[in-house]
C-alpha cells in the first residue's frame, strides 16, 4: 500500500551498497529544516537484494534489472509518492567491482552501465552509480560512525547515546571488513602520516581532522580465504587439502578454475595437475592462524611502522568501531560483548573450530551451510588481521567495539557517502541561515575524491 504524504517536512535518500558478496539498499530519512545538524539523519529501512554481488553478473547483465527490482519496489512503498522525485538514489560499488575493473575496465563499465539504466527507470532522482575508491570507503565509514555517535556535535552531553560511547569528542576509529577488502581509518595522535596516499584532511562542523586510512584490497574475508586456499594448494601436491580452518569432518570440492578466477590469487597461481581438489577440515585454530599469517608480508616496511605488505600504519589511537563483517561474524560467534577479552575470544575460537562439522550443522540448523562452514576461518581471520595485521594487543583489544547499528542505523560507508553527496556535513558550524554550497566539506576538503 502507498503511504500518504507525511504532514511533517521530511526528506529521504537512498544508497545502494553494491558489495562483493551482495547488494543492500538503505533508506535514510531526516527533518528538512534540520539537515545541517549532526545526528539527525537516520536509517528507516534496509533491503538486502537477493543474489550475489553485481560483479557476478558480468556474463548475464540482462538479469541485473530483475535482481534490483524487489528492493527498489520496497523503496517505492516506504517513501511517500509525493517525495519520490526529490529522493536522491546513489549506488556505490566497492571492492568486488574494483577487482572486476582490474581484470577488465570494459566489463566493469558494462555492468555499471546496465545498473544505471535499471535504476534510471524508477521515479526517484537517480544520481549515478560508481565504483568508490578504497579511500572513500574508509573515510565514509569513519564519517558514518562518528556522525551517529555524535562526535561532530559541539554540544557536550552528560549522557551517552550508546553503551560504549566515551563521553568526549575524541572520534572513534573505523574498522570495516567486507568480502573483498578491509579498511582501517582513524585519527592518529600527533603522528605524521608518512604516506600521502593514506592521509585525509577534513574540516567538519568547524573542526579540522587529519585522518589516516587504508583499504586492503583482497583482504576482505572471502578473498582472504581464496588467497589462503591458493597458497596452501601450492604445497599440498595432492587433490586433498587438509585445512585447519574448517571443522573436522567438513568436506568440499573446489574447482581450480574458481580458485584462480580472482586477481587476488594471481600471486599464488601455478599449474596444478588436477582440475579439482577436496578441502577436508581438520579444525585447528592455531594451525589456521599460522596459515593466515603467511598472507601478511611483514618483512618489508619502508616506514617507521607498517601494518603488512609495506603499508604505513601509525600507532593505534583511541577507540575503534568494528563493523560490517567484523560485527556479523563476531555476533554469530557470540563474541561482541564488551566484557570478552582477546584471550577469551581466542579460547572460544579454538573450541569452535575444533567442533565436528556434523555437530555444528545440528547446533545451527537454520544457517546456510555455505556461511556456516566459513565462520571458523572468518573468526580466525578477524583475530589474525586485528592482532598481527593491525597490531592490536590484548590491552588495546578492549578499545575495539563490535558495532552493528548505532541509534538504529547500520554502521558502514553508505550514510557518510550520502551525507557528503547531499552536502549535509558542513565544514563550518551551521549558522541559523543555510550556508552556500561552497563551504561544504564535499567541495573543499574531500581530497579522497580524486580518482586513482
Amino acid at each position: 500500500t502507498q503511504n500518504k504524504a507525511l504532514p511533517e517536512n521530511v526528506k529521504y535518500g537512498i544508497v545502494l551498497d553494491a558489495g562483493s558478496s551482495h547488494t543492500s539498499l538503505y533508506i535514510y530519512k531526516w527533518p528538512a529544516e534540520k539537515e545541517n545538524d549532526t545526528g539527525v539523519v537516520h536509517q528507516v529501512e534496509e533491503c538486502r537484494v537477493k543474489g550475489p554481488g553485481i560483479s557476478k553478473f558480468v556474463q548475464k547483465v540482462n538479469e541485473i534489472g530483475i535482481y534490483l527490482t524487489d528492493c527498489m519496489e520496497r523503496a517505492r512503498e516506504v517513501i511517500p509518492r509525493s517525495q519520490h522525485q526529490e529522493t536522491p538514489v546513489y549506488l556505490g560499488a566497492t571492492a568486488g567491482m574494483r577487482l572486476l575493473r582490474m581484470e577488465s575496465e570494459e566489463l566493469a563499465d558494462r555492468v555499471l552501465d546496465v545498473v544505471e539504466r535499471s535504476l534510471s527507470n524508477y521515479p526517484f532522482d537517480f544520481q549515478g552509480a560508481r565504483i568508490i575508491t578504497g579511500q572513500e570507503e574508509g573515510a565514509y565509514g569513519w564519517i558514518t560512525i562518528n556522525y551517529l555517535l555524535g562526535k561532530f556535535s559541539q554540544k557536550t552531553r552528560w549522557f551517552s547515546i550508546v553503551p560504549y560511547e566515551t563521553n568526549n569528542q575524541e572520534t572513534f576509529g573505523a574498522l570495516d571488513l567486507g568480502g573483498a577488502s578491509t579498511q582501517v581509518t582513524f585519527v592518529p595522535q600527533n603522528q605524521t602520516i608518512e604516506s600521502p596516499d593514506n592521509a585525509l584532511q577534513f574540516r567538519l562542523y568547524g573542526k579540522d581532522y587529519n585522518v589516516y586510512t587504508h583499504s586492503f584490497l583482497c583482504y576482505g574475508k572471502d578473498q582472504a580465504l581464496w588467497q589462503k586456499l591458493a597458497k596452501d594448494i601450492q604445497v599440498a601436491s595432492n587433490e586433498i587439502l587438509r585445512d585447519p580452518c574448517f571443522h573436522p569432518g567438513y568436506k568440499k570440492v573446489v574447482n581450480v578454475s574458481d580458485l584462480y578466477k580472482t586477481p587476488c590469487t594471481k600471486r599464488f597461481e601455478m599449474t596444478l595437475p588436477f582440475q579439482q581438489f577436496e578441502i577436508q577440515g581438520i579444525g585447528n585454530y592455531q594451525q589456521c592462524h599460522q596459515s593466515i599469517l603467511e598472507l601478511f608480508n611483514t618483512s618489508y616496511c619502508p616506514y617507521s611502522q607498517c601494518a603488512f605488505n609495506g603499508i604505513f600504519l601509525p600507532p593505534l589511537q583511541g577507540d575503534f568501531g568494528a563493523f560490517s563483517a567484523f560485527y556479523f561474524v563476531m555476533k554469530f560467534l557470540n563474541l561482541t560483548s564488551e566484557k570478552v577479552s582477546q584471550e577469551k575470544v581466542t579460547e572460544m575460537m579454538k573450541k569452535f573450530c575444533a567442533q565436528p562439522w556434523e555437530e555444528i550443522k545440528t547446533s545451527y540448523a537454520g544457517v546456510k551451510e555455505k556461511y556456516l562452514s566459513e565462520y571458523c576461518f572468518s573468526g580466525t581471520y578477524i583475530l589474525s588481521l586485528l592482532l598481527q595485521g593491525y597490531h592490536f594487543t590484548a590491552d588495546s583489544w578492549e578499545h575495539i567495539h563490535f558495532i552493528g547499528k548505532i541509534q538504529g542505523s547500520d554502521a558502514g560507508w553508505t550514510l557518510g557517502y550520502m551525507l557528503n553527496l547531499t552536502n549535509m556535513i558542513p565544514a563550518e558550524q551551521p549558522l541559523s541561515t543555510p550556508l552556500s554550497h561552497s563551504t561544504y566539506v564535499a567541495h573543499h576538503h574531500h581530497h579522497h575524491h580524486h580518482h586513482h
Epitope: 596452501d232 595432492n238 586433498i240 587439502l241 587438509r242 581438520i282 585447528n284 594451525q287
Partner: antibody, heavy 119, light 107 residues
Framework: EVQLVESGGGLVKPGGSLKLSCAAS????????MHWVRQAPEKGLEWVAY????????YYADTVKGRFTISRDNAKNTLFLQMTSLRSEDTAIYYC????????????WGQGTTLTVSS | DIQMTQSPSSLSASLGERVSLTCRAS??????LNWLQQKPDGTIKRLIY???TLDSGVPKRFSGSRSGSDYSLTISSLESEDFADYYC?????????FGGGTKVEIK
C-alpha cells in the same frame, strides 16, 4: 596402527630392472599421497618420487626421471616403484612414506628395502 | 631446487646436555619444514612438522623454531635414545629436499 612395509629389493645388474612395493595398512590409503625416498650407503636421505592420492600427480627427482615410474593400486593399498636402466648409484635403502597436507606430510615411514646394483 | 644446509654435520654431547641443530634454506620455505630422526637400525620417525609443531607422542624435550630462513631443532636435555641422525626436510616445493643430516653421538 599405521604401517608401511616395503618389499622387492635385491641384487640387480647395471641396466637391469626391478619393481619395489609398499604395502599400507592402518589408514585410508586412498586419501594419502605417497613418496619414495632413498638413502645410499653412508649418505643422507634423497627424495625420489611422489604420487598423489588419485594418481593424477607424479613428481620425480631429476636423477631418476625417465627411468623410474611411481604407481599405486588403491584397491590393494599398495604403492609401487618400477625401476629400469638401473645404475650403481641407485644402490640404496628405499623407503616409502605417506603424505597429506596439512599435518601428515611424510609423517610415517616404512622400514626400508635394500636395492643393490652391481655386476 | 631449494638447498637445505644443515649444521653441524655431527656433534658429540653428554646425557642431559642441551643441543641445537640448524637448517638454512636457500629460498623461502615459509615454515614448511619437518625434522626427522633416523635411528641406527634405519627406522625413520618424524619429530616436528610445520617448523615448530611437535608430533604426538614425541617427548617435550624436542622443540622446533624458526628465525627467518634458519630453522632449528633443540633437544633440551639429551637422553640415551636421542643418539641418532637428524634430518630437516622442506616441503614448500618440488623436489622435496633434505638437509645433509646431523649425527648426534655420545661423548
Amino acid at each position: 596402527e599405521v604401517q608401511l612395509v616395503e618389499s622387492g629389493g635385491g641384487l640387480v645388474k647395471p641396466g637391469g630392472s626391478l619393481k619395489l612395493s609398499c604395502a599400507a595398512s592402518g589408514f585410508t590409503f586412498s586419501d594419502y599421497g605417497m613418496h619414495w625416498v632413498r638413502q645410499a650407503p653412508e649418505k643422507g636421505l634423497e627424495w625420489v618420487a611422489y604420487i598423489s592420492s588419485g594418481s593424477s600427480i607424479r613428481y620425480y627427482a631429476d636423477t631418476v626421471k625417465g627411468r623410474f615410474t611411481i604407481s599405486r593400486d588403491n584397491a590393494k593399498n599398495t604403492l609401487f616403484l618400477q625401476m629400469t636402466s638401473l645404475r650403481s648409484e641407485d644402490t640404496a635403502i628405499y623407503y616409502c612414506a605417506r603424505d597429506l597436507y596439512y599435518d601428515h606430510v611424510l609423517d610415517y615411514w616404512g622400514q626400508g628395502t635394500t636395492l643393490t646394483v652391481s655386476s | 631446487d631449494i638447498q637445505m644446509t644443515q649444521s653441524p654435520s655431527s656433534l658429540s654431547a653428554s646425557l642431559g646436555e642441551r643441543v641445537s641443530l640448524t637448517c638454512r634454506a636457500s629460498q623461502e620455505v615459509s615454515g614448511y619444514l619437518n625434522w626427522l630422526q633416523q635411528k641406527p637400525d634405519g627406522t625413520i620417525k618424524r619429530l616436528i612438522y610445520a617448523a615448530s609443531t611437535l608430533d604426538s607422542g614425541v617427548p617435550k624435550r624436542f622443540s622446533g623454531s624458526r628465525s627467518g630462513s634458519d630453522y632449528s631443532l633443540t633437544i633440551s636435555s639429551l637422553e640415551s635414545e636421542d643418539f641418532a641422525d637428524y634430518y630437516c626436510l622442506q616441503y614448500a616445493s618440488y623436489p622435496r629436499t633434505f638437509g645433509g643430516g646431523t649425527k648426534v653421538e655420545i661423548k
